[in-house]
């Protein structure tokens, strides 16, 4: 019993003056609380609590369920307790079957004993199954059995409290342990799409998926640099014991340009937080932007291949694409494909394959593309480099020798005189007149050059060479003439092509 110091309030005294009392089932429980300021008796066992305002607690016929802690409290809030065991061979355990344990914490299997003198108070697995090897516990006859440091692996573990009575093992009702997982990582968050591109008035809907070990994970959609609460809807699932999934869907039914921005899905648990963002761009109308991959001015050698390639952005999706040359649409030799397989892709590539180009196939090649909102086009000017071709080489009535050559780039015509029968013409002759004939038209086809010299300057037998050349190659034509007396014979032209 507590010692009393004069002038200082003291706890009440209880009779019988023991900390524990054992009575048989059916016997009387009589407890007396002595204190000038007596307030009440309180009885506690498991989740049950009873009160009594009499200073003497009497239970005429004790039952196993009367086992528990009896506490007397005075007006100063001071108290004293006695624990009563009501021994009932037919009911060795008082049981509260709810059993929850937080991972890494201790949890109590609530199966207090009605008889403290039984032996081997412990836990056993159901149906004779062994308990997990690492499961440690501490028995307490008044409270139950404390499982130390609950593991996630113990979830749904079936167990009994067990004692030995007269050499036999007696089991309590079964308990199923439900483990509440501890957060050992931040939530896993993902978003349905990293970016959205919409036209005004279209619906914006984005889903954030939050995965964690339990449903106590917190999540929300936030707009960056804004405190406005966003409207979101939730769906959730438990995929197995420690695999929880929540889907938080954010919707703006009619998006406006000023809704453009970054939206963040934020989630946190006791371990930490995670977030993922999605970008919304709202445009007032669709668009197409074309980027040439090669120079829009193309020089290609005669007989060679070239690709005209564009990359373009189109939103909404492109509906019509075509390549045009001289008002004719190509039906083949071109392809159009998305730049990426991503569903939010807005970039595309179009290629026109021009094969074995001829000198006559230079000109403007146009790529046209349209969607439901806009049209766009880009033109390529294709120049075909061709070796000069000598179109005409004549002696005119005025005695001029004239050479007309066509090619691209513009050919240069040089004149040479070869005296007698020499094959090599080295002495150059200055032309009297040089003209580019079709410079007024678009310079895609061959350029035609005309050059003339005065044949009266030649006083000896020989050959005149007209040589036309450009970056691609050269071609020559020859005029043979002979003198008979003072008269020039007929001039015989012929050509020699030099690759």
């Amino acid at each position: 019993q507590p010692s009393v110091s004069p002038g200082e309030p003291s706890p009440p005294s209880i009779h019988p003056g023991k900390s524990d009392l054992i009575v048989r089932v059916g016997d009387e429980i009589r407890l007396l609380c002595t204190d000038p300021g007596f307030v009440k008796w309180t009885f506690e066992i498991l989740d049950e609590t009873n009160e009594n305002k009499q200073n003497e607690w009497i239970t005429e016929k004790a039952e196993a369920t009367n086992t528990g802690k009896y506490t007397c409290t005075n007006k100063h809030g001071l108290s004293n307790s006695i624990y009563v065991f009501v021994r009932d061979p037919a009911k060795l355990f008082l049981v509260d079957r709810s059993l929850y344990g937080k991972e890494d914490n201790d949890t109590l299997v609530r199966c207090p004993l009605t008889d403290p003198e039984v032996t081997n108070y412990s836990l056993k697995g159901c149906q004779g199954k062994p308990l997990p090897k690492d499961l440690r516990f501490i028995p307490d006859p008044k409270a139950g059995i404390m499982i130390k440091s609950v593991k996630r692996a113990y979830h749904r573990l079936c167990l009994h409290c067990s004692v030995d009575q007269e050499g036999k093992s007696v089991l309590s009702e079964k308990f199923i342990l439900k483990v509440r997982p501890a957060f050992k990582a931040v939530p896993v968050v993902s978003v349905s799409k990293a970016s959205y591109l919409l036209r005004e008035g279209e619906e914006f809907t984005v889903t954030c998926t939050i995965k964690d070990v339990s449903s106590s994970v917190y999540s929300t959609w936030k707009r960056e640099n804004s405190q406005t609460k966003l409207q979101e809807k939730y769906n959730s699932w438990h995929h197995g014991d420690f695999n929880y999934e929540r889907q938080a869907t954010l919707t703006i039914s009619s998006a406006r340009v000023n809704d453009s921005g970054v939206f963040m899905c934020y989630a946190n648990n006791t371990f930490g937080s995670a977030n993922v963002t999605t970008t919304l761009e709202v445009v007032d109308k669709g668009f197409i932007n074309i980027f040439p991959m090669i120079n829009t001015t193309v020089f290609v050698n005669d007989g060679e291949n070239v690709d005209l390639i564009v990359e373009y952005e189109a939103f909404p999706k492109p509906e019509h694409q075509q390549w045009i040359y001289m008002n004719r649409t190509f039906t083949d030799k071109w392809e159009d494909y998305p730049k990426s397989e991503n569903e939010s892709n807005i970039r595309y590539v179009s290629e026109l394959h021009l094969t074995r180009l001829k000198g006559t196939e230079g000109g403007t090649y146009t790529f046209l593309v349209s969607n439901s909102d806009v049209n766009a086009a880009i033109a390529f000017n294709v120049y075909v480099n061709t070796k000069p071709e000598i179109l005409t080489y004549d002696r005119l009535v005025n005695g001029m020798l004239q050479c007309v050559a066509a090619g691209f780039p513009e050919p240069t015509i040089d004149w040479y005189f070869c005296p007698g029968t020499e094959q090599r013409c080295s002495a150059s002759v200055l032309p009297v007149d040089v003209q580019t004939l079709n410079s007024s038209g678009p310079p895609f086809g061959k350029l035609v050059v005309q050059s003339s010299i005065d044949s009266s300057a030649f006083k000896h037998n020989g050959t005149v060479e007209c040589k036309a050349y450009n970056d691609v190659g050269k071609t020559s034509a020859y005029f043979n003439f002979a003198f008979k007396g003072n008269n020039k014979e007929q001039i015989h032209p012929h050509t020699l092509f030099t690759p």
Partner: antibody
Framework: EVQLVESGGGLVQPGGSLRLSCAAS????????MHWVRQAPGKGLEWVAS????????YYADSVKGRFTISADTSKNTAYLQMNSLRAEDTAVYYC??????????WGQGTLVTVSS | DIQMTQSPSSLSASVGDRVTITCRAS??????VAWYQQKPGKAPKLLIY???SLYSGVPSRFSGSRSGTDFTLTISSLQPEDFATYYC??????????FGQGTKVEIK
């Protein structure tokens, strides 16, 4: 006449760098896509990288991504391959090629790169 | 990425023989397949582009064809200068360029 001439190959230590050049003549590289392809001794062909010299778009094989850089100078009509953090497995003859209609129609003579300590 | 499996890896043939080399794409591809010839110490030379188009200057005994994901190079009558290694090459939108492993054509 179309011609491609590679240069810049040689012996280099692992971890070292090398810059290959591909001088083009007979055509304008800004009208085409230029590629580098390599061939390890006794092995097959492996595509390395490509560039559209006019627009600057570049593409790389996974095996060289982050280590090699393809570039071009249209005024010099030349393509380049800057190779950093070279490894023994980068030892090969490196070819420069012109690309048209999903094929490589003109190739250079190749330049040998040897990575060895 | 799309793989191109070339077969056979080598073959022996005589002058005048008809020779067929096959490349199989691991998945459906466009007709963007080319064939090259390479001789020792030399750069590859383009023979066929777009699966069946003969490149200019290439003899007409070379031809290309396609059947589903199988692409075939045929030499109708093998000539002495045709002994070399042949490569197929495929272009795909998202994987760019891949080559077959090569087929060495040797003299029997």
């Amino acid at each position: 006449e179309v011609q491609l001439v590679e240069s810049g190959g040689g012996l280099v230590q692992p971890g070292g760098s090398l810059r290959l050049s591909c001088a083009a003549s007979g055509f304008n590289i800004s009208s085409y896509s230029m590629h580098w392809v390599r061939q390890a001794p006794g092995k097959g062909l492996e595509w390395v990288a490509s560039i559209y010299p006019y627009s600057g778009y570049t593409y790389y094989a996974d095996s060289v991504k982050g280590r090699f850089t393809i570039s071009a100078d249209t005024s010099k009509n030349t393509a380049y391959l800057q190779m950093n953090s070279l490894r023994a497995e980068d030892t090969a003859v490196y070819y420069c090629a012109r690309y048209v209609y999903h094929a490589l129609d003109y190739w250079g003579q190749g330049t040998l790169v040897t990575v060895s300590s | 990425d799309i793989q191109m499996t070339q077969s056979p890896s080598s073959l022996s043939a005589s002058v005048g023989d008809r020779v067929t080399i096959t490349c199989r794409a691991s998945q459906s591809v466009s007709s963007a397949v080319a064939w090259y010839q390479q001789k020792p110490g030399k750069a590859p030379k383009l023979l066929i582009y777009s699966a069946s188009s003969l490149y200019s200057g290439v003899p007409s005994r070379f031809s290309g064809s396609r059947s589903g994901t199988d692409f075939t190079l045929t030499i109708s009558s093998l000539q002495p200068e045709d002994f070399a290694t042949y490569y197929c090459q495929q272009w795909a939108v998202h994987s760019l360029i891949t080559f077959g492993q090569g087929t060495k054509v040797e003299i029997k």
